[in-house]
Each structure stands twice: as C-alpha cells, then as structure tokens.
C-alpha cells in the first residue's frame, strides 16, 4: 500500500495586491491521523501560517470543510495579499503524538509572487531655475512594486529623451522595489509651456502606465531683452522714451529709470502682454523736461529680473 | 459500504487468532482500520488502528500481544498469547479517530478464550 | 494515558424528554476537539452520532447535539425518541495517536 502523499499541484502562483491567494494542498490518505500545517519558508526559521489543529489565522480561511467526513483537501485562502506574503508555502502533514508533533511529510511548495503596482511617478527639478542653454537635472521616484522588472522612459513634449541614468533598488530580492532615475533636458527659450513626463510600464498596470509631470515653467527663466527709444517731441520741452521689455519669464520683475545716473523712477510690473510661447512683455515710459537740462541727458532702463543682477540699456538725449 | 469481520471462534489460553475485516462498497487504503472489542456485558474498548506500513499501534495494554496489517480491501490483526479476560466481541472500524472517526463498523466477531 | 468520566451511568426518561449526558476527560484532549459519541444497541454494533466534539455525523437526526472543549463535553438529545433508547459512549482522544479511550457507557432506560 502506498503512503500518504502530501500534492501541491502549483508550483508557483502570482496575485495581485490586495486580492486573495489560493494556496492547493491535497493528501492521498487519511492516515496517519494528526494535523495539516502550511508554512512559509522552509527550515528552522519558518513561518506558521495555518494550523488546523490549533490558533486563530484570522487572514486564512480553509477552502474545504475540514470537519467534512472523508477530507483530504487542505488547500487554503489567504486575504488581502500584501508584497510581504511572497514566498514558498509548504503545506506539511504531521503525526499525531507525545511530546510534540512528528513532522509526516511535506509538500513540495508553492511560491507566491505578490505583483504591486509602483506608486504613482513623482518627477521633481532643480531648486533653482536656470537659463536658456543650460542642461538641467530631473528626478522621477515610483515605490512599493513588484516583481522587479519594470521599464521607465521619459519624454520632453512628447519627444522621448535619451540622456537618463536609472536605478531599481534593492539589487537583491526584495517584497518590493523602487526605481530611481535622473534625466538631463536641455532649456530652450521656447520651453516656458514645455512638460517633462516619466512614464513607468509594469506588468501590474495591463498595458496602462503610470506618468508623473514636471512643468518646466517651474524650472526655467527667460531673461528680458531691453529696447530704449525715443518718441517723437509730444509737447515743445518734453520727450518720451520707452523701454521695451521683451520675452521674459517668470513675471517678476522691477525697473527703474536713471537720468544721468540718478534714479528717477522705479517700478514693479504690473499689466503684461503674454507671448504665444508663455514668455512676457512689458514697456515702461518716461516722459523727459528737456527745459530742465542744460547738457546732453544719458537715459538708463535697468531691469531687475527674477532676482538676477540688473541688466541695462541707455539712451542718449541730446538738448541742442 | 460495509465491514464484515470474520476469523473469531473458540481458542484456548497461549493461543493465537487471525481476525479479518472485509470492505465492501469502499477502498480502505486510504483510510485506518481501527479495532475495539467489548467483553460480555461492559463497555467498548479500543485496541489499535492498522494503517500503512509503519503507521499501525495499538493501546498500551495491547503492544507485543496483537499486530495488524491491511490491504486495499482487508484489515487483519492478529491475537496471540490469549488470555481469558481477552474474551470479546471484536469490532473493526474504518477511520482513526480524531477528524477521521469510526464509522461504518462491522457487525463484531466473538472471540472466547477457554479451556 | 487519557481516562474518560462519563456520567451518569444510567438514566431513566420519558418519550420527548430533553437528555444530557456528559464526559470529562483527565487532560484536555487532543485539538480540545478529539472527542465523539457513539450509540450502541444490545446486540448491534456502535453507530456513530458526533465526531470533533460537535459535528453532526451524517445521516443523524438533528436531535442529537454535541458541545465543549478541552476536557468537558456533553451530548444533548432535545426530545427523546422511542428509538433513542440505548447506551452512548463517548470516545476521546490523547495526544498520542493510540491514546483513544472510551467512557465507561450511559445507559438511556424508558422510565
């Protein structure tokens, strides 16, 4: 006659977060008597994770009856399946006996991998904004998934990128992962209305990645260029010139006026015209006595933008 | 779904008994044989479970005098060194106690030991 | 080894009565739940009422109810029948796998 056989049909199993996992034990016997354990791990270090002669498994519900006449099916249910339950579970037949149960014979195990989905990417920029020209650095951070595998791209409107360095942690087995990358996008004039995304495929998103956005709005400045003019003579002993403020981001911005070197007036702006690529306009005037000057007056537009050192333009008024 | 023993009679004390227990309707290898006698007039006792190979006991009081083996379809045990207080009905059961208890039983086998 | 108390050892009742007899065991008994009931009539073999303390065996009327754990247990039979007139024994289980022994027998009399 044969002996009893403990059979684990799956020899592994994969389950989505927070479902249940469906772990199969059958026996062949009924004999000897004693109880079924399911363990995870194998070895001194093991877990218990059911036992059917004793203890309260509040996560874990028999898929059979087990007082039912005649059972010889242990498989199990375990609830709301986090990353932590992956493992091999081994479902464990034990003879009943003094001092303690005799281990009869075990299954052959069943792993369980948990897939989890990864977090929803967080893309962050520099700390300071920076100009035109220059290469700025990116981050995108997405935790908490499983398996390990998972691909990451990033793209800058639409266009995908190349110059990026990415990291899954840790290198070894884990119940879950991270992934880290950092990207390199150089700053255009034109990028004021520009996104960068970072885009996460993994297999527990069924074809439907993760995005995570940055605005470079966020992260770049477009300084001004600077236009002084003289309008025709409005009245016989005044002139007006204008100073064009053009293609600037962000708003903020402070300009005074120096008349021979003599601040004469200053102000913040205030109503801006907005450019078809996000960047703004401004135009400040001074209306200039030319009765009150008896020499040529050197006319000064100084534009303070965004907190950066004051760039300048003169003008040169003559009094004949 | 049936057990009927057979193998009972007259022995004298020393002597040996081969006791069978027969299936009908069911497989016992995936079940334990259990046997419980009860002398004239008292209550049932329990004697052992036959299983496979090595996984066959007996009570305390029973170890070294009776022995056991099965088949598919048949339990035996043996009964040697017969004593008078060894005379019984003996009843085989299919099951081994605990989440698998006695049920069906055979309808008993006398056994009386006597000179 | 395990010793089972069964008590009483006899009782007289009437048809439709309510009937409890009770077991109680040296040590706890194996799982708290290594305990059955067995019904036996003069001349016939044990047929089995309740099994892991409180399980129904199948095809036994609904009557018959066991309960407890550890080392104290009871069968109830809530209203008596004719036919229920005979010897229960319960049966409870050690830790050891030939550690099985019955109590010592009630029996149920018409009174």
């Known amino acids: 006659e044969e002996e009893l056989q403990v059979i684990q049909p799956d020899k592994s199993i994969s389950v989505a977060a927070g479902e249940s996992a469906t772990l199969h034990c059958t026996v062949t016997s009924l004999i000897p008597v004693g109880p079924i354990q399911w363990f995870r791990g194998a070895g001194p270090g093991r877990e218990l994770i059911y036992n059917q002669k004793e203890g309260h498994f509040p996560r874990v519900t028999t898929v059979s009856d087990l007082t039912k006449r005649n059972n010889m099916d242990f498989s199990i249910r375990i609830s709301n399946i986090t990353p932590a339950d992956a493992g091999t579970y081994y479902c464990v037949k034990f003879r009943k006996g003094s001092p303690d149960h005799v281990e009869f014979k075990s299954g052959a195990g069943t792993e369980l991998s948990v897939r989890a989905k990864p977090s929803a990417p967080v893309v962050s920029g520099p700390a300071a904004r920076a100009t035109p020209q220059h290469t700025v650095s990116f981050t995108c951070e997405s935790h908490g998934f499983s398996p390990r595998d998972i691909t990451l791209k990033w793209f800058k409107n639409g266009n995908e990128l190349s110059d990026f360095q990415t990291n899954v942690d840790p290198a070894g087995d884990s119940v879950s992962y991270s992934i880290h990358s950092t990207a390199k996008v150089v700053l255009t004039r034109e990028d004021v209305h520009s996104q960068v995304i970072c885009e996460v495929a993994h297999v527990t998103l069924q074809g439907d990645p993760l995005r995570g956005t940055a605005n470079l709005s966020e992260t770049i400045r477009v300084p001004p260029t600077l236009e002084v003019t003289q309008q025709p003579v409005r009245a016989e002993n005044q002139v007006n010139v204008t100073c064009q403020v053009r293609k600037f981001y962000p708003q903020r911005l402070q300009l005074t006026w120096l008349e021979n070197g003599n601040v004469s007036r200053t102000e913040t702006a205030s109503t801006l015209t907005e450019n078809k690529d996000g960047t703004y306009n401004w135009m400040s005037w001074l209306l200039v006595n030319v009765s009150a000057h008896r020499d040529d007056v050197k006319l000064t537009c100084q534009v303070e933008h965004d907190g950066q050192p004051a760039v300048s333009k003169s003008h040169d008024l003559k009094v004949s | 779904r049936q057990l009927v023993e057979s193998g009972g009679g007259l022995v004298q004390p020393g002597g040996s008994l081969r006791l069978s227990c027969t299936a009908s309707?069911?497989?016992?290898?995936?079940?334990?044989i259990s046997w419980v006698r009860q002398a004239p007039g008292k209550g049932l006792e329990y004697i052992g479970t036959?299983?496979?190979?090595?996984i066959t006991y007996f009570a305390s009081w029973a170890k070294g005098r009776f022995t056991g083996s099965k088949t598919s379809s048949t339990a035996y045990m043996e009964l040697s060194s017969l004593r008078s207080e060894d005379t019984a009905v003996y009843f085989c059961?299919?099951?081994?106690?605990?989440?698998?208890?006695?049920?069906?039983w055979g309808q008993g086998t006398l056994v009386t030991v006597s000179s | 080894d395990i010793v089972m108390t069964q008590s009483p050892s006899s009782l007289s009742a009437s048809v439709g009565d309510r009937v409890t007899i009770t077991c109680q065991a040296s040590?706890?008994?194996?799982?708290?739940?290594?305990l059955a009931w067995y019904q036996q009539k003069p001349g016939q073999a044990p047929k089995l009422l309740i099994y892991?303390?409180?399980t129904l065996a199948t095809g036994v009327p609904s009557r018959f109810s066991g309960s407890g754990s550890g080392t104290d247990f009871t069968l109830t039979i809530s209203s008596l029948q004719p036919e229920d007139f005979a010897t229960y024994y319960c049966?409870?289980?050690?830790?050891?796998?030939?550690?099985?022994?019955f109590g010592q027998g009630t029996k149920v009399e018409i009174k």
């Open positions: 059961a299919r099951g081994s106690a605990w989440n698998d208890p006695f049920d069906p």
């Open positions: 309707g069911f497989s016992l290898s995936s079940h334990g």
């Open positions: 036959i299983g496979t190979g090595v």
């Open positions: 040590q706890s008994v194996y799982g708290n739940n290594d």
């Open positions: 892991l303390a409180s």
């Open positions: 049966l409870g289980g050690g830790d050891d796998e030939a550690d099985n022994t």
